[in-house]
C-alpha cells in the first residue's frame, strides 16, 4: 500500500481467483484514543472500533472511503483504491491502446518546436467518475523539472456504437535548452482513477522524436507568364523555433489531381518557394519537416490550382 | 579549410558536409517507427557517447559570441564517432551490407573533422577509452544505438553550420 495523495491510498493486488489479497491497517488521524468507530462509504454499518482498523483487501467491494467517527463526528477519512496486477502485468483497462506507432501505446505526445513545450493525449471510452493527474520530468535518476497543466477533455468522437473521449495535457520543460542535443529523455507519468480502480501509464521520449511542425503558412500561387507553370510560395509556421537560419525546415510540394488515383507530382526543397505545373482541377499542397532530423512531417497546407 | 588561430571555419563547406552527414546517418539507420530504445542498459550507451550540451555555446547567441567553444565540441564528437564507426562494433560480424552507407558516413565524419582542424592549430589529441569487446549478438543493438545518437549529434552540428554559413561567413 502507498499514498497517492493526502488520505488516498493505493493497494496493489495480485488479481487471480481466490487470491489472498492484502492486509491493510488503517489508522484514524486523531489524538482521540477511545470510542472510535469505522464505516465504509455511505453505509452506517460499523466495521470495527478502536484507533486502528485491520482489513483484508481482496476485491473492489473492500475498497472505498473508510471513515473513523466518534460520537457522530467524523474524525478522518482514508480512500482505498485498487491497482490490479494480472499475470505479473499491471492492468490497463481505463485507457485505449492507440496502437500507433506500436502496440501498447496509451499516451501519444507531440511538440510543435524545440521550446520544451509539448502536448500529450490519450483515449478512453469511460465518460464518468474519471480523474487524471500528470507528472513529468527530464530523466529519472536525477530528474529535472517539467511542469504540466491539468488534463482536460479535448474531443469526443463516435466510433461505431461507442463514444470515445480524448483527454490532453500541455507540459513545459522548466529550463529548456532548444539548441542542445538531448541526452536524457522526457518521462511522462499519468495516474488514472476510475471509480475505485487506479492505473498508471508512462511514456518516455526525446523532444526531437516527437517534433511535428505546424503546416506552412501563407501558401500562395503566382502564375508564370505564357506558361502552365506557377510559382508556389509559403512561409515558416509561426510556431516553429527561431532563428530559421538555425532551426531550418525542409518542404515537400505536391500537385494532386481531383481523383485520388491520379499520379501525384512531388518536389522536395529547402527553399520557401517552388515552380510546379498546375493541372486543371488539381490542388497544390506543401508540408514541412525538420531539415536535419527525420521526425514527423507536418499536416498539408493546400490551395486549389484554379 | 579553416585558418590557424581562433578564426572561422569554411562555414559553407561545413554546412554542405554536415547536411550530407545527416542524410547518411538516416540512410544508415532509418527510423523503424519510433523504435523504443530505452530498455535496460540503454542509458549506459547513451551516456557513453558525446552530446552537445547547453553550455557548449552551440546556440545562435553562443556562436555569435565565440564559435570556437562549439566548434571544438563538435570536433571532439566527430572524432569520437569516427573511432566508434571504425571499431569492431561496425567492422566485425555480422558484416554490414556491401552498399551500407556506414563506410561513407565514417569517411564523412573524418572529412568534416579535418575541415574543422585548422592547419598548424591542434586541439588536444583525442583519446577514447578501450571499448568493451562485443559479440555479434550485441553489435547489432550497439550499432542501432550509436547511429540513433549520431543522428541527434549531427543534426545539432548541421544547424550550427547552417546558421554560421548564413550569419557568420565573411
Amino acid at each position: 500500500i502507498w499514498e497517492l495523495k493526502k488520505d488516498v491510498y493505493v493497494v496493489e493486488l495480485d488479481w487471480y481467483p481466490d487470491a489472498p489479497g492484502e492486509m491493510v491497517v488503517l489508522t484514524c488521524d486523531t489524538p482521540e484514543e477511545d470510542g472510535i468507530t469505522w464505516t465504509l462509504d455511505q453505509s452506517s454499518e460499523v466495521l470495527g472500533s478502536g484507533k486502528t482498523l485491520t482489513i483484508q483487501v481482496k476485491e473492489f467491494g473492500d475498497a472505498g472511503q473508510y471513515t473513523c467517527h466518534k460520537g457522530g463526528e467524523v474524525l478522518s477519512h482514508s480512500l482505498l483504491l485498487l491497482h490490479k496486477k494480472e499475470d505479473g502485468i499491471w492492468s490497463t483497462d481505463i485507457l485505449k491502446d492507440q496502437k500507433e506507432p506500436k502496440n501498447k501505446t496509451f499516451l501519444r505526445c507531440e511538440a510543435k518546436n524545440y521550446s520544451g513545450r509539448f502536448t500529450c493525449w490519450w483515449l478512453t471510452t469511460i465518460s464518468t467518475d474519471l480523474t487524471f493527474s500528470v507528472k513529468s520530468s527530464r530523466g529519472s535518476s536525477d530528474p529535472q523539472g517539467v511542469t504540466c497543466g491539468a488534463a482536460t477533455l479535448s474531443a469526443e468522437r463516435v466510433r461505431g456504437d461507442n463514444k470515445e473521449y480524448e483527454y490532453s495535457v500541455e507540459c513545459q520543460e522548466d529550463s529548456a535548452c532548444p539548441a542542445a542535443e538531448e541526452s536524457l529523455p522526457i518521462e511522462v507519468m499519468v495516474d488514472a482513477v476510475h471509480k475505485l480502480k487506479y492505473e498508471n501509464y508512462t511514456s518516455s521520449f526525446f523532444i526531437r522524436d516527437i517534433i511535428k511542425p505546424d503546416p506552412p503558412k501563407n501558401l500562395q500561387l503566382k502564375p508564370l507568364k505564357n506558361s502552365r507553370q506557377v510559382e508556389v510560395s509559403w512561409e515558416y509556421p509561426d510556431t516553429w523555433s527561431t532563428p530559421h537560419s538555425y532551426f531550418s525546415l525542409t518542404f515537400c510540394v505536391q500537385v494532386q489531381g481531383k481523383s485520388k488515383r491520379e499520379k501525384k507530382d512531388r518536389v522536395f526543397t529547402d527553399k520557401t518557394s517552388a515552380t510546379v505545373i498546375c493541372r486543371k482541377n488539381a490542388s497544390i499542397s506543401v508540408r514541412a519537416q525538420d531539415r536535419y532530423y527525420s521526425s514527423s512531417w507536418s499536416e498539408w497546407a493546400s490551395v486549389p490550382c484554379s | 579549410r579553416a585558418v590557424p588561430g581562433g578564426s572561422s571555419p569554411a562555414w559553407t563547406q561545413c554546412q554542405q558536409l554536415s547536411q550530407k552527414l545527416c542524410t547518411l546517418a538516416w540512410s544508415a539507420h532509418p527510423l523503424v517507427g519510433h523504435m523504443d530504445l530505452r530498455e535496460e542498459g540503454d542509458e549506459e550507451t547513451t551516456n557513453d557517447v558525446p552530446h552537445i550540451q547547453c553550455g557548449d555555446g552551440c546556440d545562435p547567441q553562443g556562436l555569435r559570441d565565440n564559435s570556437q567553444f562549439c566548434l571544438q565540441r563538435i570536433h571532439q564528437g566527430l572524432i569520437f564517432y569516427e573511432k566508434l564507426l571504425g571499431s569492431d562494433i561496425f567492422t566485425g560480424e555480422p558484416s554490414l551490407l556491401p552498399d551500407s552507407p556506414v563506410g561513407q558516413l565514417h569517411a564523412s565524419l573524418l572529412g568534416l573533422s579535418q575541415l574543422l582542424q585548422p592547419e598548424g592549430h591542434h586541439w588536444e589529441t583525442q583519446q577514447i577509452p578501450s571499448l568493451s569487446p562485443s559479440q555479434p549478438w550485441q553489435r547489432l543493438l550497439l550499432r542501432f544505438k550509436i547511429l540513433r545518437s549520431l543522428q541527434a549529434f549531427v543534426a545539432v552540428a548541421a544547424r550550427v553550420f547552417a546558421h554560421g554559413a548564413a550569419t557568420l561567413s565573411p
Partner: antibody, heavy 120, light 113 residues
Framework: QVQLQESGPGLVKPSETLSLTCTVS????????VHWIRQPPGKGLEWIGV???????DYNPSLKSRVTISVDTSKNQFSLKLSSVTAADTAVYYC??????????????WGQGTLVTVSS | DIVMTQSPDSLAVSLGERATINCKPS????????????LAWYQQKPGQPPKLLIY???TRQSGVPDRFSGSGSGTDFTLTISSLQAEDVAVYYC?????????FGQGTKLEIK
C-alpha cells in the same frame, strides 16, 4: 540486489593450479563483465583479468601466461584458474562486476573475497 | 600500463576536519568526446572488500554520504572527505578503467589524529 560469492580451497601447494569459483545471484549474468582482483596480505589491489559478457577475456599482461577465466552460464558461475603458483600468489581473491556498456565500467559490486595461501 | 600514484601514503586527520587524498595517473583518463574521466575511488575497511564511493571522477555512488566528493580531470584527481567521521577510517584506493590493464593506486591509509 546483486551478490557475488567466491569459493575454493584456502590452501594450494607451490607449482599447483589455484582454482576459484564466483557465484552470482540476483541478476542475469549475461549483462555483467566479471573481473578478478587480488590483494596480497597488507598490500594493495591488483587487477587479474576480466571475462566479458560474450565470453571473451582480457588478462593483466603480468599474469597472462598463467591465467584462465571462464564462465558456466547454466550455474551462474565464473571461474579463475592460476597455474604454477608461488608464495607471491598468496592473496585475498575477489570477483567483482561492471555493468555492460560501450566502455568497461568501474566495479560496483564485489564478492567478500577468499584468502588463498600458497604453501607446502 | 597506466601507473596510478596516490599521495600521501598515510594521513591522520582530526574528527570533523577535512581529509584530502590525491591520485595522479601517468596518462590522461579524460575522454574529451564524452567528457568522462574513467577514474573511481574505493574505500576498504579491514576484512572487507573495497566499496565504491565515486565513479567517473566526481559522481557519488548512491548511498554514499555527501561528505565524500571527487574532483579533478585528466591527470590530477582528488578525493575529499569534508568532515571526517570515525567510521571513515580505512584505506582509500583510486582505480583507472580507461585502458587495459586496469590499475589501482597503491592506497592511502586514513587515520584519526
Amino acid at each position: 540486489q546483486v551478490q557475488l560469492q567466491e569459493s575454493g580451497p584456502g590452501l594450494v601447494k607451490p607449482s599447483e593450479t589455484l582454482s576459484l569459483t564466483c557465484t552470482v545471484s540476483g541478476g542475469s549474468i549475461s549483462s555483467y563483465n566479471v573481473h578478478w582482483i587480488r590483494q596480497p596480505p597488507g598490500k594493495g589491489l591488483e587487477w587479474i583479468g576480466v571475462i566479458w559478457t560474450g565470453g571473451s577475456t582480457d588478462y593483466n599482461p603480468s599474469l597472462k601466461s598463467r591465467v584462465t577465466i571462464s564462465v558456466d552460464t547454466s550455474k551462474n558461475q565464473f571461474s579463475l584458474k592460476l597455474s604454477s603458483v608461488t608464495a607471491a600468489d598468496t592473496a585475498v581473491y575477489y570477483c567483482a562486476r561492471d555493468k555492460y556498456g560501450l566502455f568497461p565500467g568501474y566495479f560496483d559490486y564485489w564478492g567478500q573475497g577468499t584468502l588463498v595461501t600458497v604453501s607446502s | 600500463d597506466i601507473v596510478m600514484t596516490q599521495s600521501p601514503d598515510s594521513l591522520a586527520v582530526s574528527l570533523g576536519e577535512r581529509a584530502t587524498i590525491n591520485c595522479k595517473p601517468s596518462q590522461s583518463l579524460l575522454s574529451s568526446g564524452n567528457r568522462k574521466n574513467y577514474l573511481a575511488w574505493y574505500q576498504q575497511k579491514p576484512g572487507q572488500p573495497p566499496k565504491l564511493l565515486i565513479y567517473y571522477a566526481s559522481t557519488r555512488q548512491s548511498g554514499v554520504p555527501d561528505r565524500f566528493s571527487g574532483s579533478g580531470s585528466g591527470t590530477d584527481f582528488t578525493l575529499t572527505i569534508s568532515s571526517l567521521q570515525a567510521e571513515d577510517v580505512a584505506v582509500y584506493y583510486c582505480l583507472q578503467h580507461f585502458n587495459y590493464p586496469w590499475t589501482f593506486g597503491q592506497g592511502t591509509k586514513l587515520e584519526i589524529k
